[in-house]
């Protein structure tokens, strides 16, 4: 007998063809011999089956000797053997209906687990293979689990159910809730305004929750809260803010913080957490601030950086358009009795200058 796979909630069309290309009498029955539907001349008749209001046929095809059974809004319990009786013949079709659902919300926090559950008719032994938007394949039986969801797992998951060498495909849209970047570094000269941005990697109709930025200054022995805020329908409102520094926060997404001045005492690392309504767990983004200061005190020209820098970074002092006078993989460099002119302090790595500060040294008379 023919096997047809269907998806829960979908519509299926079971075919039945007579050898005569004309409208003749036919009946569709289930395995209990209960009539589902048939015809009487050109009229569609329905039997007492539980499919009554969901079963139909295509009258336009009867004249061609085709008598399909259409079942709408499929249910797992519709899985059965359906018999088409026409011209003293019986055509049997086995219908197997499957359902695949995410057994939690389809909006999940980065790092959480996704579990997909397969609903299948009794007696079936399907296999399932799912492919994530980034090409990851997972296989299983009745349940499939993916732990530690990543940002790249956002999108349409395509799952193929295989039974009796037939396939049916499901598509499930998953949204991974995360910040666009796990970590970022801002390099600033002393006194410059600092902009911290925390763009989200997803869009939802309504976004409600609360957040906080904790800051660990390089010079401080412990971390402290800098700001707490609420998020209501994508509108940001500050609940509490420290007096030093005087942070300002944007009222709209993306989350945006402004530090009026980069100062050595603020250099360090921050952790912004966002707790979303009806979600367990929090979103995190690390942000780092590196501050540079160039100063001249009497006969000493000094350049210093504060904050979380890689030990590979080079700090240099050079007179404009000349070779570096001093370069060290350290956080402070200096030149004694500097020549007059425009001096540059440079923080650089193998690929670029990350931060630059100019200081004018006046001639000593």
């Amino acid at each position: 007998k023919k096997v047809v796979l269907g998806k829960k909630g979908d519509t299926v069309e079971l075919t039945c063809t007579a050898s005569q290309k004309k409208s003749i009498q036919f009946h569709w029955k289930n395995s209990n011999q209960i009539k589902i539907l048939g015809n009487q001349g050109s009229f569609l008749t329905k039997g007492p089956s539980k499919l009554n209001d969901r079963a139909d046929s295509r009258r336009s095809l009867w004249d061609q000797g085709n008598f399909p059974l259409i079942i709408k809004n499929l249910k797992i319990e519709d899985s059965d053997t359906y018999i088409c009786e026409v011209e003293d013949q019986k055509e049997e079709v086995q219908l197997l209906v499957f359902g695949l659902t995410a057994n939690s919300d389809t909006h999940l926090l980065q790092g959480q687990s996704l579990t997909l559950t397969l609903e299948s008719p009794p007696g079936s032994s399907p296999s399932v293979q799912c492919r994530s938007p980034r090409g990851k394949n997972i296989q299983g039986g009745k349940t499939l689990s993916v732990s530690q969801l990543e940002l790249q797992d956002s999108g349409t998951w395509t799952c193929t159910v295989l039974q009796n060498q037939k396939k049916v495909e499901f598509k499930i849209d998953i949204v991974v809730l995360a910040f666009q970047k796990a970590s970022s570094i801002v390099y600033k000269k002393e006194g410059e305004q600092v902009e911290f941005s925390f763009p989200l990697a997803f869009t939802v109709e309504k976004l409600t929750g609360s957040g906080e930025l904790w800051w660990q200054a390089e010079r401080a022995s412990s971390s402290k809260s800098w700001i707490t805020f609420d998020l209501k329908n994508k509108e940001v409102s500050v609940k509490w803010v420290t007096q030093d520094p005087k942070l300002q926060m944007g009222k709209k997404l993306p989350l945006h913080l402004t530090l009026p001045q980069a100062l050595p005492q603020y250099a360090g690392s921050g952790n912004l957490t966002l707790a979303l309504e009806a979600k367990t767990g929090k979103l995190h983004q690390e942000v780092n601030l590196v501050v540079m200061r160039a100063t001249q005190l009497q006969k000493n020209l000094t350049c210093e950086v504060w904050g979380p820098t890689s030990p590979k970074l080079m700090l240099s002092l050079k007179l404009e358009n000349k070779e570096a006078k001093v370069s060290k993989r350290e956080k402070a460099v200096w030149v004694l009795n500097p020549e007059a002119g425009m001096w540059q302090c440079l923080l650089s790595d193998s690929g670029q200058v990350l931060l630059e500060s100019n200081i004018k040294v006046l001639p000593t008379w």
Epitope: S184, I185, L313, S350, G351, Q352
Partner: antibody
Framework: QVQLVESGGGVVQPGRALRLSCAAS????????MHWVRQAPGKGLEWVAI????????YYADSVKGRFTISRDNSKNTLYLQMNSLRAEDTAVYYC???????????????WGKGTTVTVSS | DIQMTQSPSSLSASVGDRVTITCRAS??????LGWYQQKPGKAPKLLIY???NLQSGVPSRFSGSGSGTDFTLTISSLQPEDFATYYC?????????FGQGTKLEIK
Amino acid sequence: QVQLVESGGGVVQPGRALRLSCAASGFTFSSYGMHWVRQAPGKGLEWVAIIWYDGSNKYYADSVKGRFTISRDNSKNTLYLQMNSLRAEDTAVYYCAREVALEGYYYYMDVWGKGTTVTVSS
Amino acid sequence: DIQMTQSPSSLSASVGDRVTITCRASQDIRNGLGWYQQKPGKAPKLLIYTTSNLQSGVPSRFSGSGSGTDFTLTISSLQPEDFATYYCLQDYNYPYTFGQGTKLEIK
């Protein structure tokens, strides 16, 4: 497309010198740090040296310090490795590789050449 | 200089297996660690950078984790093309140093 092609390998006697070249194409060579990495026959990878984007800084593995010199000519999009006082243990395939440096935080060698073979033997 | 100790030095596994390779640094390297794959006669290929960032075009069955001194490369479900030698590289400070490699063979 982005490409690195090494040349200059060959058979050389111990104590002699050899200069390897690495021709870069398909990217702005002067914006990247560049490495030499080597692999002795049947052995693992060994980092040799790095030169910064502007040639201002160079760092070496202890095993080659004082004998090898890394240099670059940004106008010719070419990286060099001058190898002096060669020893049998310098026999290896020499690869050049591009270093990506992002935000002074993320570093990686994303593009590699196919390698050139250096054999030091009497 | 920072020493990198990779283990195991060789590993036999089957297609579909989950495989873990570890790398230990002789001192704290924060998250300055990358993983490279090399096949015989070929140049190394970048898989993971800065501990856990998947390089563009690398299959998501590869993942990296760790921080400080202990790091892990995990292949969630081995594919035939994954049989190769894997190296960790500390790029936290100069001189850079590779681990001695892990040869992944078919069981």
